[in-house]
Interface confidence: low
């Protein structure tokens, strides 16, 4: 008498998440008489997927009439199959007795559950940075399975190489996670560009997830700074010009100080924007020469993006312009509020 | 009948490079991890470095990182090792395993018999 | 990287006997451990993976156990070919680890 043998002749099975799984059983003889279960995993700790005789499995279908005559395919379908279904299923032959007793397992068919992963999300460094620094943007991705997963960085559509990516848990899980990190060296160019996290994964069928990051959130421009003397009015006034150039983000703060003492105080705001992202601005000073005895230190601060102030200075000479007797008033300031002349 | 069967052994110089080969058969190659694990003479096991299914992920002992490579042609159900700057603490049989799932679970539950590296001068 | 101790090194046991090995990780490995052994001049073995989960065709004297960072293999009643080098390896993080191995031998 040939030996009863139970075949399950897929080693492994891979399902989309959502769809139905059949796992194939096939069994050499009818004799003896008894029953076949399936289970998941092996051991004392098995858990119990398919009982014909009882039990209650929504998800689970024979695929074949086990109950007509002859019957020798004990194949089941899950339906709605989730990544927490994925494992090894036994088929199982019992022969019958009080109670029944395990003869013979099948070896076992590996289901693998393929869930496509979440929407890459990317993440950018806590404060900016200035150009020729590096800074770090992180992609991470969650729930996928099988573990199988491809993620590339681009800037600007250029790929990056500066990258170091995990998958966990290294061992068996459900679903996998991906985390990567590309490093970013800045340039004063990079108000406008982009970086774009691109995940490959066998769910997606050839149309891979990307999530972006703006580099505009990471990069501080610092400003150029340029104090010009514009030449003498008719009227004894020099219109003094701070030039703060290609700067960003916007928000920046400008000081005028006489000899010192603070003559007038501006912020940016509403700036047009340069090609390259950056913003340019330009106030002015006028300042009767006629009022002073001395020549007049003028100082252009600026505060950019909580960064500690810029100086430049320029000297008025009020020995080469006639002064106004009897006049020790402090320097009038007239200066307007007028910005961004181009 | 499910097997691996290595080639590529052999006596090479320290700095020297060696392919390593294992033919798979009997199975669907492209839906398997495999590894290379090696044994010195009189030692015990140690895992070299593995590879996805798919070949898309790779991984690495530190011993060999930098100088060893793994790859796979899934068309020819073929694995390979290129050791480069092989040193004497390199001689080992090399053993092919194969995963029982495609992303490194279970352990390796098919192995070859191996194939000898000896580094020396 | 995680290190992998066996023990005992070697194991002394008469046929018949249970046998029992220990395999510890340096740090948690969860559930991901697998056994195997290995005869003199043959290709390892896969036991046990999962920690407790016997390979296709393994006979039920061999049983694994433990979770975390402590392991253990169990020969329930030891059989003449039983006699052999045992393997522990940790699959929860790159690299992957091998124990030093036990040498069970016929007391």
């Known amino acids: 008498e040939e030996e009863l043998q139970v075949i399950q002749p897929e080693k492994s099975v891979s399902v989309a998440a959502g769809d139905s799984a059949t796992l194939n059983c096939t069994v050499s003889s009818l004799i003896p008489v008894g029953p076949i279960q399936w289970f998941r995993g092996a051991g004392p700790g098995r858990e119990l997927i398919y009982n014909l005789k009882e039990g209650h499995f929504p998800r689970v279908t024979p695929v074949s009439d086990p109950t007509k005559r002859n019957n020798m395919d004990f194949s089941i379908r899950i339906s709605n199959i989730t990544p927490a279904d994925a494992g090894t299923y036994y088929c199982v032959k019992f022969r019958k007795g009080s109670p029944d007793v395990e003869l013979k397992s099948g070896a076992g068919t590996e289901l693998s559950v393929r869930a496509k992963p979440s929407a890459p999300v990317v993440s950018g460094p806590a404060v900016r940075a200035t150009a020729e620094h590096t800074v770090s943007f992180t992609c991470e991705s969650h729930g996928f399975s099988p573990r199988d997963i491809t993620l590339k960085w681009f800037k600007n559509g250029n790929e990056l190489s500066d990258v170091q990516t995990n998958v966990d848990p290294a061992g068996k899980s459900v679903s996998y996670s991906i985390r990567s990190t590309a490093r970013v060296v800045l340039t004063r160019r990079d108000v406008h560009s982009q970086v774009i996290c691109e995940v490959a994964h066998v769910t997606l069928q050839g149309d891979p997830l990307r999530g972006t990051a703006n580099l505009s959130e990471a990069i501080r421009v610092p400003p150029f700074l340029e104090v010009t003397q514009q030449s003498m009015r008719a009227d004894n006034q020099v219109n003094v010009t701070c030039q703060v150039t290609k700067f960003y983000p916007q928000r920046l703060q400008l000081t005028w100080l006489e000899n010192g003492n603070v003559s007038r105080t501006e912020m940016a705001s509403a700036l047009p924007e340069n090609k390259d992202g950056t913003y340019n601005w330009t106030s002015w000073l006028l300042v009767n020469v006629s009022a002073h005895r001395d020549d007049v230190k003028l100082t252009c601060q600026v505060e950019h993006d909580g960064q500690p102030a810029v100086n430049k200075s320029f000297s008025v000479k009020v020995s080469a312009h006639p002064k106004e007797q009897g006049s020790n008033t402090a320097a009038e300031n007239t200066g307007t509020n007028e910005r961004n002349i181009y | 009948e499910v097997q691996v069967l290595e080639s590529g052994g052999g006596l090479v110089q320290p700095g020297g490079s060696l392919r390593l080969s294992c033919a798979a058969s009997?199975?669907?190659?492209?839906?398997?991890?495999m590894s290379w694990v090696r044994q010195a003479p009189g030692k015990g096991l140690e895992w070299v470095s593995a590879?996805?299914?798919?070949?898309?992920?790779?991984h690495y002992a530190d011993s060999v990182k930098g100088r060893f490579t793994i790859s796979r042609d899934n068309s020819k159900n073929t694995l390979y090792l290129q050791m480069n700057s092989l040193r004497a603490e390199d001689t080992a049989v090399y053993y092919c395993?194969?995963?029982?799932?495609?992303?490194?679970?279970?352990?390796?539950?098919?192995w070859g018999q191996g194939t000898t590296v000896t580094v020396s001068s | 990287e995680i290190v992998m101790t066996q023990s005992p090194a070697t194991l002394s046991v008469s046929p018949g006997e249970r046998a029992t090995l220990s395999c510890r990780a340096s740090q948690s490995v969860s559930s991901n451990l697998a056994w195997y052994q290995q005869k003199s001049g043959q290709a390892p073995r896969l036991l046990i993976y999962?920690?407790?989960t016997r390979a296709t065709g393994i006979p039920a004297r061999f049983s694994g156990s433990g979770s975390g960072t402590e392991f253990t293999l169990t020969i329930s009643s030891l059989q003449s070919e039983d006699f052999a080098g045992y393997y522990c390896q940790q699959y929860n993080n790159w690299p992957y680890t091998f124990g030093q191995g036990t040498k069970l031998e016929i007391k």
């Open positions: 395993a194969a995963y029982s799932g495609s992303y490194y679970y279970y352990g390796m539950d098919v």
């Open positions: 009997g199975f669907t190659f492209s839906s398997y991890a």
């Open positions: 999962g920690a407790s």
């Open positions: 590879i996805s299914g798919s070949g898309s992920s790779t």
